[in-house]
């Protein structure tokens, strides 16, 4: 009679993570008598997956009833496959021996490859806010996928970005892989409502890529422009001066009025108006009692936006003569003071 052969008909099996893998194995003879064992890997470090004779293998079930005397089908099913299960599985026939069974013949092996979906991409931006016209870095990470081939794209508001670098790790063979990409994004003044999107395509996703997003509202700081304007006289001795704070984001803003360098009032922006581009406008006013001042008054609108160093705009108020006309100081934003006389 021809010597027993162990046949593993499948050179490779591809299974999606979470599914069940069937590893086929048949013997050509009932002789010699002895059990079958399944191993992952070969050599002394191989890992026992299933032993027909003894042991507890909760994830493994046999395809046929191995207790039947004439059974020559030693195929197994492994449930709930993860990328860690990838490897080459060997079906090995043992000959009954004393005290131990002796390995008799091994199958050629079946390589189990696990298709694992990438995790949802996580996009993160810079540690601190940045202002328009600056280039900032965004990172995108996704983990746990297999096989290694993967495609990653970046978009800003639907427009594909080209300035990015992507790495898939590890470089060599592995049970699963991770992708890390860094994109450079130029911020514009209109980006409060913008989004940066990282899109990952993989064979496991059936053409429906995963997306991670970052809202640029979390990244951008649009600094305000200031305009101090004197309003027409409300009463004989009162002058109304307004400070227009325009086109800022985020909303966090504190305004301080100074009269000749002394704090007159401090307030926090609350009832702001929102512009179409997502930035905010706010106006504060100061009623100055001219008769209370003997000399000229320098009024300063000082704004601290989003914890940044204060910027200010000043306006000189002449008290020696009654105001005749509306003055305007339209310079946008300054850290100094305006020495022009408005009257």
């Amino acid at each position: 009679e021809e010597e027993l052969q162990v046949i593993q008909p499948d050179k490779s099996v591809l299974v999606a993570a979470g599914e069940t893998a069937t590893l086929r194995c048949t013997a050509t003879s009932l002789i010699p008598v002895g059990p079958i064992q399944w191993f992952r890997g070969a050599g002394p470090g191989r890992e026992l997956i299933y032993n027909q004779k003894e042991g507890h293998f909760p994830r493994v079930t046999t395809v046929s009833d191995l207790t039947k005397r004439n059974n020559m089908d030693f195929s197994i099913r492994i449930g709930n496959i993860t990328p860690a299960d990838a490897g080459t599985y060997y079906c090995v026939k043992f000959r009954k021996g004393s005290p131990d069974d002796v390995e008799f013949k091994s199958g050629a092996g079946t390589e189990l490859s696990v298709r694992a979906k990438p995790s949802a991409p996580v996009v993160s931006g810079p540690a601190a806010r940045a202002t328009p016209q600056h280039t900032v870095s965004f990172t995108c990470e996704s983990h746990g996928f297999s096989p290694r081939d993967i495609t990653l794209k970046w978009f800003k508001n639907g427009n594909e970005l080209s300035d990015f670098q992507t790495n898939v790790d590890p470089v060599g063979e592995s049970v699963s892989y991770s992708i890390h990409s860094t994109a450079k994004v130029v911020l514009t003044r209109e980006d409060v409502h913008s989004q940066v999107i990282c899109e990952v395509a993989h064979v496991t996703l059936q053409g429906d890529p995963l997306r991670g997003t970052a809202n640029l509202s979390e990244t951008i700081r649009v600094p305000p422009t200031l305009e101090v304007t004197q309003q027409p006289v409300r009463a004989e001795n009162q002058v109304n001066v307004t400070c227009q704070v325009r086109k800022f984001y985020p909303q966090r803003l504190q305004l301080t009025w100074l009269e000749n360098g002394n704090v007159s009032r401090t307030e926090t922006a609350s009832t702001v108006t929102e512009n179409k581009d997502g930035t905010y406008n706010w106006m504060s006013w100061l009623l100055v009692n001219v008769s209370a001042h003997r000399d000229d008054v320098k009024l300063t609108c000082q704004v601290e936006h989003d914890g940044q160093p204060a910027v200010s705009k000043s306006h000189d108020l002449k008290v020696s003569a009654h105001p005749k006309e509306q003055g305007s100081n339209t310079a946008a934003e300054n850290t100094g003071s305006n020495e022009r006389n408005i009257y």
């Epitope: 810079p126 540690a127 601190a128 806010r129 940045a130 202002t131 016209q133 600056h134 280039t135 900032v136 870095s137 911020l187 990244t219 700081r221 649009v222 600094p223 422009t225 940044q308 160093p309 910027v311 705009k313 100081n329 339209t330 310079a331 946008a332 934003e333 300054n334 850290t335 100094g336 305006n338 020495e339 022009r340």
Partner: antibody, heavy 119, light 107 residues
Framework: EVQLQESGAELVRPGASVKLSCKAL????????IHWVKETPVYGLEWIGD????????ANNQKFKGKATLTADKSSNTAYMELSSLTSEDSAVYYC????????????WGQGTSVTVSS | DIQMTQSSSSFSGSLGDRLTINCKAS??????VAWYQQKPGNAPRLLIS???SLETGVLSRFSGSGSGKDYTLSINGLQAEDVATYYC?????????FGGGTKLEIK
């Protein structure tokens, strides 16, 4: 007192690289941008670019793309500009300056670093 | 890039004169203009930002004005220590750009 301390004068060979440093003192380094400006007799003052140490954000003059690389080390409150593939055209005085983040003028300037490219 | 044009590269004035230095931008820069003074061998010094605001410590004989594309630096009562080169600079759009400078001399 706000100060920007720049590294000393450099004499370098054509084709080489040089890394200039700018140490910020007297203010919170991560709250302000550091800008770099080139001065030559022919072109006057030219803005190279800036870096915001807090966000890592940079803005650059396309004219200096591939020539100047801006970095910042928050732990030492120092900004750096590396100039590569130097030619005689890169001989100049380079200034680091400070500006409030956003659209603000450069309110403090370093003393300048003279770079001479010569064989 | 926005071009900043200073109409005169040099200017000669007498002590006590009032003089103006003009700067024209190639497009609207929304008051984001600064003026710097540079004395020989020194770094530039910020005099005025946001068109008209004097920096702390800058004497009030310096003033700035303008809007849109046209901006002016005025010195009222020229002093010997004002001998320097004056630059305008826009900081509305990157790349920030400077004017070519106006060298001021005393007659």
């Amino acid at each position: 007192e706000v100060q920007l301390q720049e590294s000393g004068a450099e004499l370098v060979r054509p084709g080489a690289s040089v890394k200039l440093s700018c140490k910020a003192l007297g203010y919170t380094f991560t709250d302000y941008e550091i800008h770099w400006v080139k001065e030559t007799p022919v072109y006057g003052l030219e803005w190279i670019g800036d870096i915001h140490p807090g966000s890592g954000g940079t803005a650059n003059n396309q004219k200096f793309k591939g020539k100047a690389t801006l970095t910042a080390d928050k732990s030492s409150n120092t900004a750096y500009m590396e100039l590569s593939s130097l030619t005689s055209e890169d001989s100049a005085v380079y200034y680091c300056t400070r500006a409030v983040s956003g659209y603000y003028a450069m309110d403090y300037w370093g003393q300048g670093t003279s770079v001479t490219v010569s064989s | 890039d926005i071009q900043m044009t200073q109409s005169s590269s040099s200017f000669s004035g007498s002590l006590g004169d009032r003089l103006t230095i003009n700067c024209k931008a190639s497009e609207d820069i929304y008051d984001r203009v600064a003026w710097y003074q540079q004395k020989p061998g020194n770094a530039p010094r910020l005099l005025i930002s946001g068109t008209a605001s004097l920096e702390t410590g800058v004497l009030s004989r310096f003033s700035g004005s303008g809007s849109g594309k046209d901006y002016t630096l005025s010195i009222n009562g020229l002093q010997a220590e004002d001998v320097a080169t004056y630059y305008c600079q826009q900081y509305w759009t990157t790349p920030w750009t400077f004017g070519g400078g106006t060298k001021l001399e005393i007659k």
